[in-house]
């Protein structure tokens, strides 16, 4: 039975040209995290494998940086970066947990962070 929950940074906003940290945290389970995949809609951004470390998709290497931790830093944001991002935790023995973050990239300087929320 999957008992864990994914806590994410929730709905967030950031300024065009700036950077943002996408973070997820898996709690309430003793399952071992073997890999975390980061996706933007259906596109792979990065993989963090427990044994092999990071693989950043070549399509995003110039503006995606690994970390902190299992998170991902998006740089040089454009309005086209607005949308859904998913952290996909592969665990043993539980299986797969998925967290969702919605990022809005704003033209103005009034980018405020949304509250944290949980996905069971």
């Amino acid at each position: 039975m999957m008992t864990g929950t994914i806590e994410t940074t929730g709905n967030i906003s950031a300024e065009k040209g700036g950077s943002i940290i996408l973070q997820c945290h898996l709690s309430s389970t003793t399952a071992q995290v073997t890999q975390v995949n980061w996706e933007q809609q259906d596109q792979l951004l990065a993989i963090c494998n427990a044994d092999l470390g990071w693989h950043i998709s070549p399509s995003f290497k110039d503006r995606v940086a690994p970390g902190p931790g299992l998170g991902l830093t998006l740089q040089s944001l454009t309005v086209n970066d607005t949308g859904e991002y998913f952290c996909i935790y592969h665990t043993y023995p539980d299986g797969t947990y998925t967290g969702r973050i919605f990022l809005e990239v704003l033209e103005s300087s009034v980018a405020e962070h949304g509250a944290r929320f949980q996905i069971p």
Epitope: N37, L44, I47, L52, G53, H55, P58, S59, K61, H90
Partner: antibody, heavy 118, light 107 residues
Framework: QIQLQQSGAELVRPGTSVKMSCKAV????????INWVKQRPGHGFEWIGD????????NYNEKFKGKATLTADTSSSTAYMQLSSLTSEDSAIYYC???????????WGQGTSVTVSS | DIVMTQSQKFMSTSVGDRVSITCKAS??????VVWYQQKPGQSPKALIF???NRHTGVPDRFTGSGSGTDFTLTISNVQSEDLADYFC?????????FGGGTKLEIK
């Protein structure tokens, strides 16, 4: 010992298709990307695309979209590449090579020779 | 696409010599460059990854250097078994692209 074992040479007719295989031995198949590369004498190496069996992510070189189809079977640790509508330009040696992050294409298969001839 | 240019198609050297093979990228690829050796009738073997890191089991006479657009593979104390083609690969961006290769001939 890490090995990528590729299927044998193929002699095929123009206009037909061919499907070749690449069996991974000695490492966790789902952890690494499988790249496919074409080598033709006088033309050097061309990257066709890659597939990540651990998530079925696939990337193609635009030049080979519609020509190559990449698949993987995790139960047998085997990757496949199908080439369609074959012409003489497709006569080449095709290699599979594993990769991940900094270790881009670190181990290669022995190659599959494809000859397209009527 | 990023073009990887190896301007020397052939290089001739003698056993014990030092030889440098160069590769130039058409745009900045940071250090995402791999060097390979391919002997006749064999598949490529990785020598250097991330421009300057030797792959497992590669003799220390092979060294790689460079970043950005200019990369060099140096073979010091060349041995007869080093007779092969050498080529570079960039994996900074899709599509991955290869240099045309440099054939090392032993005098």
């Amino acid at each position: 010992q890490i090995q990528l074992q590729q299927s044998g040479a193929e002699l095929v007719r123009p206009g037909t298709s061919v499907k070749m295989s690449c069996k991974a031995v000695g490492y966790t198949f789902t952890n690494y990307w499988i790249n496919w590369v074409k080598q033709r004498p006088g033309h050097g190496f061309e990257w066709i695309g890659d597939i990540y069996p651990g998530g079925y992510y696939i990337n193609y070189n635009e030049k080979f979209k519609g020509k190559a189809t990449l698949t993987a079977d995790t139960s047998s640790s085997t990757a496949y590449m199908q080439l369609s509508s074959l012409t003489s330009e497709d006569s080449a040696i095709y290699y599979c090579a594993r990769g991940y992050g900094s270790y881009a294409m670190d181990y290669w298969g022995q190659g599959t020779s494809v000859t397209v001839s009527s | 696409d990023i073009v990887m240019t190896q301007s020397q198609k052939f290089m001739s050297t003698s056993v014990g010599d030092r030889v440098s093979i160069t590769c130039k990228a058409s745009q900045n690829v940071r250090t995402d460059v791999v060097w390979y050796q391919q002997k006749p009738g064999q598949s490529p073997k990785a020598l250097i990854f991330l421009a300057s890191n030797r792959h497992t089991g590669v003799p220390d006479r092979f060294t790689g250097s460079g970043s950005g657009t200019d990369f060099t593979l140096t073979i010091s104390n060349v041995q007869s078994e080093d007779l092969a083609d050498y080529f570079c690969l960039q994996h900074w961006n899709y599509p991955y692209t290869f240099g045309g290769g440099t054939k090392l001939e032993i005098k």
